[in-house]
Interface confidence: low
């Protein structure tokens, strides 16, 4: 995808404006594409991403990627359309309203992913066991 | 049950300024992004301003930017509008709405308050 | 902007009538098309989302059709409850705009 914040400003300086909300209107997120972090050993962090954007495509929700290797850790924050895999990876959570980290095999490195459908939703990454989707009070704010 | 309430409307001269606001109750407030839709008498809809669910970005339409604010309180669940420089053509009933938040499963404006009426005369 | 165009601007009906109203987009909006139900003095009410969803709770004798410019609105059976404004929007592009509405009246 293309960073939307290169299209589209995002400020008060739009010509006119976004969503009165209906369904499939793209969606806002973080984009600040890969940036080295401080988050590690946390039960959920702050992107520290300033850029909101409007996604690209109507589709798109927001996903956060956490890597860490030997020399670093790097947080990557997109739109993406859940029906295309990223990092090789299909987006199985593309509709929760929570960034919920899970853990993905990538050789030489500690990866995790997360993906989610509320605005600016991959601007607080979760690792914690405790949200996940067999939480009722998780499912009932996805669905109700 | 969701609930959007709406309150602060009432007469006010061209140039003046009122805030309304707008309690939520009933879901989940910080996820969802809030907007404002008002329907001059006897008119259609139309769409006014949005605000993220933490509050960290805001559109406006063309016919009100530079003279309404929108803002959020999500500690106390609740969604404001400031008007100032108003007109006699910013007469109408606002309305709060929940923005759907899930694109694919539930979709459209899909709550909205009672409305508050704004008349702006002199 | 995005121009929204219904018709009728109103129309008379009867109980147990099939009602249809239609709404033109002035561009291409796949199927980004919502329809609302206001009755007077109240807040308008969601009934159909991405053209042809029909919004929890609402009744299966709404239905909604059409995709790319071209939409219509479908009351398979009008009930006393169903006369009102009815309202399609679209939320393809910013800003999202509203049609000027369609008035079911008591014939």
């Known amino acids: 995808t293309i960073p939307p914040h290169v299209q589209k400003s995002v400020n008060n300086d739009m010509i006119v404006t976004d969503n009165n909300g209906a369904v499939k209107f793209p969606q806002l997120c973080k984009f600040c594409d890969v940036r080295f972090s401080t988050c590690d050993n946390q039960k959920s962090c702050m992107s520290n991403c300033s850029i909101t954007s409007i996604c690209e495509k109507p589709q798109e929700v927001c996903v956060a990627v956490w890597r860490k290797n030997d020399e670093n850790i790097t947080l990557e924050t997109v739109c993406h359309d859940p029906k295309l895999p990223y990092h090789d990876f299909i987006l199985e959570d593309a509709a929760s309203p929570k960034c919920i980290m899970k853990e993905k095999k990538k050789p030489g490195e500690t990866f995790f992913m997360c993906s989610c459908s509320s605005d600016e939703c991959n601007d607080n990454i979760i690792f914690s066991e405790e949200y996940n989707t067999s939480n009722p009070d998780l499912l009932l704010v996805i669905f109700q | 049950e969701v609930q959007l309430v709406e309150s602060g409307g009432g007469l006010v001269q061209p140039g003046g300024s009122l805030r309304l606001s707008c309690a939520a109750s009933?879901?989940?407030?910080?996820?969802?992004?809030m907007t404002w839709v008002r329907q001059a008498p006897g008119k259609g809809l139309e769409w006014v301003s949005v605000i993220s669910g933490s509050g960290g970005t805001v559109y406006y339409a063309d016919s009100v930017k530079g003279r309404f604010t929108i803002s959020r309180d999500n500690s106390k669940n609740t969604l404001y509008l400031q008007m100032n420089s108003l007109r006699a053509e910013d007469t109408a009933v606002y309305y709060c709405?929940?923005?759907?938040?899930?694109?694919?499963?539930?979709?459209?404006?899909?709550?909205w308050g009672q409305g508050t009426l704004v008349t702006v005369s002199s | 902007d995005i121009q929204m165009t219904q018709s009728p601007s109103s129309l008379s009906a009867s109980v147990g009538d099939r009602v249809t109203i239609t709404c033109r987009a002035s561009q291409s909006i796949s199927s980004y098309l919502n329809w609302y139900q206001q009755k007077p003095g109240k807040a308008p009410k969601l009934l159909i989302y991405?053209?042809?969803s029909l919004q929890s709770g609402v009744p299966s004798r709404f239905s909604g059709s059409g995709s790319g410019t071209d939409f219509t609105l479908t009351i398979s059976s009008l009930q006393p409850e169903d006369f009102a404004t009815y309202y399609c929007q679209q939320s393809y592009s910013t800003p999202p705009t509203f049609g000027q509405g369609t008035k079911v009246e008591i014939k």
């Open positions: 991405a053209a042809s």
């Open positions: 009933g879901f989940t407030f910080d996820i969802y992004a």
């Open positions: 709405a929940r923005r759907g938040q899930y694109r694919d499963i539930a979709g459209g404006t899909d709550y």
